[in-house]
């Protein structure tokens, strides 16, 4: 049902990384516009992206209010130039999104190695604690602030001269690893939330190697 030439949105998909969250859908509009609504399971619907010709809507501002809530969105279709018009049941056509719980589902963004420092046969590798768009007490929280003990990092490291990789894990943002004296090493890190069933791991960080600007070397 619905007004002539108005089609319901379909393929509603949540795209979310480090809580930056966008709802995408199809089709590209022809003589129609869309409005999105979002709600928690127990809350009221809030309208966003009014009468847009886009096929995406940034819902970050809504979901960061409580990333542990479960959200549902719906996309309404209206005839272009006649947004008061409704379907045969007296309502505009709409389609529901899948449920989305940001804390359990947002993708982990690609981490960055902030620095590494060698002291003798030990190297300290520090992962940047990326800022999210989640706020508390008027400050933006870091990824660690939000995920706390649920977030670990895996370090992959190898001698520049060979391909054999070793791994280390930390529940902080720092690694302290043993290295061979006189050897240069390369590093890459990955964020992991072991308790998840989906989106458990980030992509690997860019590789950083000793002997480049980011690190510091001290012979003790």
């Amino acid at each position: 049902s619905g007004t002539t030439n108005t089609v319901a949105a379909y393929n509603l998909t949540w795209k979310s990384t480090n809580f930056k969250t966008i709802l995408e859908w199809e089709p590209k509009p022809v003589n129609q516009v869309y409005t999105v609504q979002i709600s928690t399971k127990s809350g009221d619907w809030k309208s966003k992206c009014f009468y847009t010709t886009d096929t995406e809507c940034d819902l970050t501002d809504e979901i960061v209010k409580d990333v542990k809530q479960t959200y549902l969105a719906r996309v309404f279709s209206y005839p272009a130039g006649n947004v008061e018009s409704t379907g045969s049941a007296g309502e505009p056509l709409y389609e529901n999104s899948p449920e989305f719980t940001p804390y359990l589902e947002t993708n982990l963004g690609q981490p960055t190695i902030q620095s590494f420092e060698q002291v003798g046969t030990k190297v300290n590798v520090t992962v940047e604690d990326e800022r999210t768009l989640v706020r508390r007490n008027n400050t933006f929280l870091s990824l660690r602030d939000v995920f706390g003990k649920d977030l670990i990092y895996t370090l992959y490291y190898w001698k520049s001269s060979s391909s054999g990789k070793k791994t280390a894990k930390t529940n902080t943002n720092e690694f302290l690893i043993d290295v061979d004296k006189g050897e240069n090493y390369c590093f890459s890190v990955q964020a992991v939330i072991p308790s998840r069933t989906v989106n458990r791991k980030s992509t690997d960080s860019p590789v950083e190697c000793m002997g480049q600007e980011k690190g510091e070397f001290r012979e003790i």
């Epitope: 939000v146 003990k149 072991p194």
Partner: antibody
Framework: QVQLQESGAEVKKPGASVKVSCKAS????????IEWVRQAPGQGLEWMGE????????KYNEKFKGRVTMTADTSTNTVYMELSSLRSEDTAVYYC??????????????WGQGTLVTVSS | QAVVTQEPSLTVSPGGSVTLTCRSS?????????ANWIQQKPGQGPKTLIS???NRGPWTTARFSGSILGDKAVLTLWGAHAEDEADYYC?????????FGGGTHLTVQ
């Protein structure tokens, strides 16, 4: 408001199993860890394990591994803790607790009222 | 498994201040241990005062504060009242499990 309602007291014989329930309300059940802590008479608190209902991920105290099982039913917002091969030293009050809002505050925010389990022949 | 150590008992005068400590057998306590301080009065269930080292619960009076001092987690109570007499437990997180200290019995007299 957040509430954790535990099941009633149990009396069990040595070697039996007990299953304690913890029904949660007032928040998004799937997103918060539920901790299980016990306290024997006149003794301190002892952590048994935790479960994240949304993924059924669990972590157990090594001391109880093989004897304890934690499960979650997201349709009823209830977490269960089953302890098997009971012995007299398992006589205790068993508490469930929910963690805090965000990571930097992790821990034991809201507590159930406790379930007394008595193991006696 | 790590051992978490607390003073078995402490006494404070009404209106006085007292510091309870929480030590880890594995080395210095850090913010990654997410220290929790839990109060339990006789015949009652536990009540968490502080989580994540220094975050007060909404029900926690400002007379309690948590911090890390040197290599230990500490709970400081200012202006002790008679109703603060209780057992106080510290809990520390170690990568994949919590460990409770043996508790400190605080007497206000």
């Amino acid at each position: 408001q957040v509430q954790l309602q535990e099941s009633g007291a149990e009396v069990k014989k040595p070697g039996a199993s007990v299953k304690v329930s913890c029904k949660a309300s007032g928040y998004t059940f799937s997103s918060y860890w539920i901790e299980w802590v016990r306290q024997a008479p006149g003794q301190g608190l002892e952590w048994m394990g935790e479960i994240l209902p949304g993924s059924a991920s669990t972590k157990y105290n090594e001391k109880f591994k093989g004897r304890v099982t934690m499960t979650a039913d997201t349709s009823t917002n209830t977490v269960y803790m089953e302890l098997s091969s009971l012995r007299s030293e398992d006589t205790a009050v068993y508490y469930c607790a929910r963690d805090y809002y965000y990571g930097s505050s992790y821990g034991f925010a809201y507590w159930g009222q406790g379930t007394l389990v008595t193991v006696s022949s | 498994q790590a051992v978490v150590t607390q003073e078995p008992s402490l006494t404070v005068s009404p209106g006085g201040s007292v510091t309870l400590t929480c030590r880890s057998s594995t080395g210095a306590v850090t913010t990654s241990n997410y220290a929790n301080w839990i109060q339990q009065k006789p015949g009652q269930g536990p009540k968490t005062l502080i989580s994540g080292t220094n975050n007060r619960g909404p029900w926690t009076t400002a007379r309690f504060s948590g911090s890390i001092l040197g290599d230990k987690a500490v709970l400081t109570l200012w202006g002790a009242h008679a109703e603060d007499e209780a057992d106080y437990y510290c809990a520390l997180w170690y990568s994949n499990h919590w460990v409770f200290g043996g508790g400190t019995h605080l007497t206000v007299q």
